[in-house]
Interface confidence: low
């Protein structure tokens, strides 16, 4: 009968002819009376056989990722009679994997949005690399993820590629971060290959800034002839947040005379001081009122940033008008 062990050839072998193993008949007594033949796809081009001994060699570099096994046929003939000594037999040469493929991130580019001030542990995004090497062959395709750029704000789970927040970030200081992730095969052992990807992480705004008046004192004037409803001037606060988190409402905090009102222009985010009651220079020629400003929308969990509303003092001078 035929005698052989399982045949394996490592891919990417650089030797001009690599010995794979030996096929032989147990009737072969080693006196060169038998001739071995190789048939099938790759016989004579990729693989050759020593006709006398049955030794098989690979004469080309093989790529497992292109083809992982070859099915060949063997014959053994008695040279003297020309008859087959054994029935023709099929055998397999398996191409064994080497770590010759680096992990690749196939879903690039990565981009994620996460709210500023998110707590540690918040999930940002998962990046996934794939490796063309054989997952069943040692650790050639077992990947470990690590963070090359992005500390101390981000961390990556080594086995899943899940990126999490590891330190609170303030959008008003920096609104986006480039994180560089490396995937390394061989679970990081020597001989590992790596691939890298960049992740753009943008911070979305949360209402963590209250509006603050630009001035602590505003001076306005009003003519005693001004009718009620007259706009006598504007006041302005600034808010480091953006969008609806920067929308604000102005109101009167103190006006003993109840002569003035403040309305909010929601397009410009200015406060407009309005005359609520007519003024009389001869009766009172100046007023002092206090205004405050608050954000329009403040979720309950962010109230801690908005405890004390910003206030400003407005001095209003009444201008005299000649009366008939």
């Amino acid at each position: 009968g035929w005698v052989w062990n399982q045949f394996f050839v490592p891919e990417e072998m650089n030797t001009t002819s690599h010995h794979i193993g030996q096929l032989r008949s147990d009737l072969d007594n080693g006196n060169n009376s038998f001739q071995y033949k190789l048939l099938g796809a790759g016989a004579g081009s990729t693989f050759i056989i020593d006709e006398r001994t049955g030794d098989i060699y690979a004469i080309q570099k093989l790529d497992r990722e292109e083809r992982s096994l070859y099915i060949l046929r063997a014959q053994v003939i008695d040279i003297a009679t020309g008859r087959a000594v054994e029935p023709e037999s099929e055998f397999v040469i398996k191409v064994s994997d080497i770590n010759d493929n680096e992990p690749k991130f196939l879903d690039e580019p990565y981009e994620a949005i996460v709210p500023e001030m998110s707590p540690e542990g918040t999930l940002v995004i998962q990046v996934t690399a794939s490796d063309a090497d054989d997952p069943s062959s040692g650790n050639n395709a077992r990947l470990l993820y690590s963070l090359l750029q992005g500390q101390p704000y981000f961390s990556v789970e080594p086995t899943t590629g899940v990126i999490r927040i590891s330190s609170k970030m303030d959008r008003e200081l920096q609104d986006e971060y480039w994180v560089i992730i490396q995937a390394k095969d061989m679970i990081g052992q020597p001989g590992a290959l790596s691939g890298t990807t960049s992740v753009l992480i943008k911070l979305s705004d949360v209402n963590d800034n209250k509006p603050i008046f630009k001035e602590s004192l505003y001076r306005l004037t009003v003519s005693e002839s001004a009718p009620t409803g007259t706009s006598i001037g504007t006041i302005m606060a600034y808010d480091n947040d953006i969008g609806e988190n920067a929308e604000m409402d102005y109101s009167i905090e103190e006006d003993d005379s109840q002569t003035f009102d403040i309305i909010t222009n929601h397009e410009t985010q200015e406060g407009i001081v309005i005359l609520k009651k007519k003024v009389d220079f001869e009766h009172q020629n100046h007023y002092g009122i206090r205004a405050k400003v608050k954000n329009h929308h403040v979720p309950e969990q962010l109230m801690k940033y908005h405890t004390e509303a910003s206030t400003t003092f407005i001095k209003i001078q009444v201008e005299d008008v000649d009366e008939p």
Epitope: E102, L148, Q149, I180
Partner: antibody, heavy 120, light 110 residues
Amino acid sequence: QVQLVQSGAEVKKPGASVKVSCKASRYTFTSYYMSWVRQAPGQGLEWMGIIHPSGGDTTYAQKFQGRVTMTGDTSTSTVYMELSSLRSEDTAVYYCARGGIKLWLHFDYWGQGTLVTVSS
Amino acid sequence: HSVLTQSPSASGTPGQRVTISCSGSRSNIGSNFVNWYQQLPGTAPKLLIYTNNQRPSGVPDRFSGSKSGTSASLAISGLQSEDEADYYCAVWDDSLNGWVFGGGTKLTVL
């Protein structure tokens, strides 16, 4: 903005040594690698070696092995590059360049360069 | 002779697109990030492209980088006279355990 300020120009005789300094400011000195790169007149850039200032770990280009020594002083945020047994072909502008947090991450800031002239 | 191969010169007219290539091997470009530096006459090199295709702040989006296998390229679109400079590719080489630079490409704006 990160700043790397190098020492002034030097004129040396063949066989002598030169020590160039590079003072870093406005970043955490101990977190980043520092490389030295030189450029001979009219030639391209040539990497000489790299040092991590916190541990003093160094990796030198094969060509300069045995002739170059890189050191760091964390108290003054300064790195030094000393080249010995100078020859005329060492005449070049020597740059320090801040690397990344890994050996193989880019150089994002460069010093202004120090001209070293080797002449008898 | 450099480990990374760059053509020594390139040229273009204002507004044109120019590509500068950098060829290496598996141990450098094939397995590490490619970076590009611009060196204007008489000045220190400046980082132009990092991690294959990222631009530092302040670098116009006319500059772009790409990498494929063991080669990388730098593209400059809408060429301007101030782009006249030397351009170098650089990458860490795992076999040499050190940084390698291309020989540099002198870009002339005609």
